[in-house]
């Protein structure tokens, strides 16, 4: 698989999109996993709703969310408020039996939130009518590993 | 704290259509789905579908299709449940319930809508 | 639909003793993912139900310890260590492992 890499800022939301065939993968269940070192294990970060038929419903662990659009064929992860930990290489998976396709394998980079830097007096707060309650602004920018690129820091 | 607050009692005639609602707060409403459950004496609890409040999608148990219908307005974050072409049977408590995260299903409900159907 | 059987239908316990309540699936609710989604919630007379126990055994918070749940495949029994008068009520189990999910029919717990 070649690795995929999403960008996102620091303080805001990462949407993940891992496409695959939907007749391929019919009922079956997804999952987000982090991968552990080159070749260490992948972690189990979320998966998809026990019910196949409710995948369309947004599981959340912590600050992951994971949803599933079973006919469209796009499995969409969620990470909320993204850390400088956050970054590193993941993978969407399909679950069948105790076995793990791989869909897509995912290097997330997080980027420093540039408003960091700025005075305080330069900051725009949401005034007491506004709420952020439903603006989850995700954004994603994503691009593949070129050839020979490496995921993984060198380990010395 | 996490409340659902559902709209009052309702007594109707046979035939017409009733609108339940369901306003979650205390909480991110389009990080929870949201279900409806009916209590009747015949049937005990039944659930009928969930909703999700994040993007409008809905499952529905089988034998509620063409019965009931779910939506959701995010702006109000409220969870509707319309019951169409009402009969006798329809008579019961429906109740919303708040979908948990991961396998904390359905954690916390609303206290109950009343609905009556008699001629 | 997986049919869920809740006994007994009542309950008369003393203010002070244990009580049992047992619920039995149809199938087994195992998951595949080795999780069993078996739940159990508490309808008080005039208050909405609440969840008091989750996946078989996890305790909501604010359940006293006092609760516990415990079985797997197809028996699955709640107890109450010692009974208080705030436990009356109605006690239900339900399931989340097979669609569309379903629930028993409730066991009332009357204080003696």
């Known amino acids: 698989h070649n690795t995929t890499v999403f960008q996102g800022v620091a303080g805001q939301s990462l949407q993940v999109s891992c496409p695959y065939d939907s007749m391929k993968h019919w009922g079956r269940r997804k999952a987000w996993c982090r991968q552990l070192g080159e070749k260490g294990p992948c972690q189990r970060v979320v998966s998809t709703h026990n019910l196949w038929l409710l995948s369309f419903l947004r599981r959340w662990n912590g600050s992951t969310a994971i949803t599933d659009d079973t006919l469209g064929g796009t499995l969409t992860i969620t990470l909320r408020n993204l850390q400088p930990h956050d970054a590193g290489l993941y993978q969407c998976q399909s679950l069948h039996g105790s076995e793990a396709d791989t869909l897509r394998k995912v290097l997330v980079e997080v980027l420093a939130d540039p408003l960091d830097h700025r005075d305080a007096g330069d900051l725009w707060f949401p005034g007491e009518s506004e709420s952020f309650e439903d603006a989850h602004v995700e954004h994603s920018i994503s691009r593949s590993l070129l050839e020979g690129e490496i995921p993984f820091p060198p380990t010395s | 704290q996490v409340q659902l607050q559902q709209s009052g009692a309702d007594l109707l005639r046979p035939g017409v259509s009733v609108k339940i609602s369901c306003k979650g707060s205390?909480?991110?409403?389009?990080?929870?789905?949201m279900h409806w459950v009916k209590q009747s004496h015949a049937e005990s609890l039944e659930w009928i579908g969930v909703i999700s409040t994040y993007s409008g999608d809905t499952g529905y148990n089988q034998k509620f299709k063409g019965k009931a219908t779910m939506t959701v307005d995010k702006s109000s974050s409220t969870a509707y449940l319309e019951l169409a072409r009402l009969t006798s049977e329809d008579s019961a408590i429906y109740y919303c319930?708040?979908?948990?995260?991961?396998?904390?299903?359905?954690?916390?409900w609303g206290q109950g809508t009343s609905v009556t159907v008699s001629s | 639909d997986v049919v869920m059987t809740q006994t007994p239908l009542t309950l008369s316990v003393t203010i002070g003793q244990p009580a049992s309540f047992s619920c039995k699936s149809s199938?087994?609710?195992?998951?595949?993912?080795?999780?069993?989604?078996l739940n159990w919630l508490l309808r008080r007379p005039g208050q909405s139900p609440k969840r008091l126990i989750y996946v078989v055994s996890k305790l909501d918070s604010g359940v006293p310890d006092r609760f516990t749940g415990s079985g797997s495949g197809t028996d699955f029994t709640l107890k109450i260590s010692r009974v208080e008068a705030e436990d009356l009520g109605v006690y239900y189990c339900w399931q989340g492992t097979h669609f569309p999910y379903t629930f028993g029919g409730g066991t009332k717990l009357e204080i003696k």
């Open positions: 319930a708040r979908e948990g995260h991961y396998d904390d299903a359905m954690d916390y």
């Open positions: 199938q087994s609710l195992l998951d595949s993912d080795g999780k069993t989604y």
């Open positions: 205390g909480y991110t409403f389009t990080d929870h789905a």
